[in-house]
């Protein structure tokens, strides 16, 4: 049967993002409509037809445009994505003979990790803190020269949609750690980044 091919996209916050739909059909559509999926009912964003060209709904006027003006292949572009733009979007191809044929493309917004790594000596122990804030939530691991060192992790969700993961490494015999390298590893969207810290006696 006639179908629409789409691809989900993941883009960085405050950058442009594009979603594309392709009608797998010998014939072009009569009109293409893009809608945002909502809990109750979908919200019309923009239409394109030969008769009327591009018609953008007021709520999306300065946010999007159709950047591929096709009736078989259609692309919408968000100029500057925010967290509110995350979600799934429907492209509806109203075709002659086969009615409305739809596809769904989902947009995920990510924020690159911001990482801080620092240490603090107490009288008889050393705390090394690694904190990573990102979207989606990052994971924090430690690479230390020897095993058996305890750590504790706290996760905090922020109103802006990011998540902070803070891990504290508790070292009971800090003297053995002086001059040695500790590595905090942050895993985000399949990529591991190392952050290195050499402990110096303050």
């Amino acid at each position: 049967q006639v179908q629409v091919v789409t691809q989900d996209e993941r883009e960085q916050l405050y950058t442009p993002a594009s979603l594309k739909c392709s009608l797998q059909n010998a014939q072009e559509a009569l009109i293409v409509t893009w809608q945002k999926k909502k809990a109750v009912s979908p919200e019309n964003m923009v239409t394109f037809s030969e008769n009327h060209g591009v018609v953008i709904q007021p709520a999306y006027k300065d946010k999007i445009n159709i950047t591929q003006l096709g009736l078989q292949n259609s692309t919408i572009t968000f100029w500057n994505i925010t967290l509110e733009d995350e979600g799934c979007y429907m492209c509806l191809f109203n075709t002659f003979g086969f009615g409305k044929i739809s596809g769904t493309a989902c947009l995920t917004v990510y924020v690159q990790p911001i990482v801080s790594l620092h240490y603090k000596f107490s009288e008889d122990h050393l705390n090394i803190t690694c904190s990573a804030t990102a979207r989606p939530a990052p994971m924090v691991f430690w690479k230390v020269p020897r095993s058996g060192i305890e750590n504790s992790t706290v996760t905090l969700s922020h109103p802006n949609g990011t998540t902070s993961v803070t891990s504290i490494l508790h070292i009971k015999d800090p003297k053995n750690q002086v001059g040695k390298e500790v590595i905090c590893q942050v895993l985000h969207l399949g990529t591991v980044t190392d952050f290195k810290q050499t402990v110096n006696k303050g």
Partner: antibody, heavy 117, light 107 residues
């Protein structure tokens, strides 16, 4: 030049089936929808259904309750319309036509199907 | 199904006359309407698609207008070859449906 040539007239008994062919030439067969329309004596035109030869996707008028089947043989650039469980009211001229989206430009010459006991 | 009603059912006119045929849909069909001409014993011939677009090769004396539920076909100056039956077709919603036809006869 573009041509749609339909098969010849048929006389069928009630309850039988008829298969009408529509041979296309002069263009790329898979680029156009083939549609079928019929006209009973003195009646308005009636849309039966259509097929997109590119994918073989078809759509039918539910009035025919599954009695109509539209198929294509792309290697022969031919479309077929089969109507089963024939009754007297199916006596009509059956036309095929091609369309690019909603642009109809060429029609077959028509095939008279007579259903009579 | 969407009902298409044409008026008048028949019409007598003379060569050179301006003629208007109307087609009314039972619900909004946007601009998804075509007009056809049919002569006795012949296949229909497409004249207008998408309410107001002229099919290639059709004389410019034919024009279409309307959107929503009310549509018209106008022949600005009747020629002898224009005497025929005219049908409208809606293709906004399946099943696609034709009007009952308007027979245009010589007065």
């Amino acid at each position: 030049q573009v041509q749609l040539v339909q098969s010849g007239a048929e006389v069928k008994k009630p309850g039988a089936s008829v298969k009408v062919s529509c041979k296309a030439s002069g263009y790329s067969f898979t680029d156009y929808i083939i549609l079928w329309v019929r006209q009973a004596p003195g009646q308005r035109l009636e849309w039966m259904g259509h097929i997109d030869p590119y994918y073989g996707s078809s759509n039918y008028n539910l009035k025919f309750k599954g009695r109509v089947t539209i198929t294509v043989d792309t290697s022969a650039s031919t479309a077929y319309m089969e109507l089963s469980s024939l009754r007297s009211e199916d006596t009509a001229v059956y036309y095929c036509a091609r369309s690019k989206r909603d642009y109809f430009d060429y029609w077959g010459q028509g095939t008279l199907v007579t259903v009579s006991s | 199904d969407i009902q298409m009603t044409q008026s008048p059912s028949s019409l007598s006119a003379s060569v050179g006359d301006r003629v208007t045929i109307t087609c009314k849909a039972s619900q909004d069909i946007n601009s998804y309407l075509s007009w056809f001409q049919q002569k006795p014993g012949k296949a229909p011939k497409s004249l207008i698609y998408r309410a107001n677009r002229l099919v290639d090769g059709v004389p410019s004396r034919f024009s279409g207008s309307g959107s929503g539920t009310d549509f018209t076909l106008t022949i600005s100056s009747l020629q002898p070859e224009d005497f025929a039956i005219y049908y409208c077709l809606q293709y906004d919603e399946f099943p696609y449906t034709f009007g009952q036809g308007t027979k245009l006869e010589i007065k």
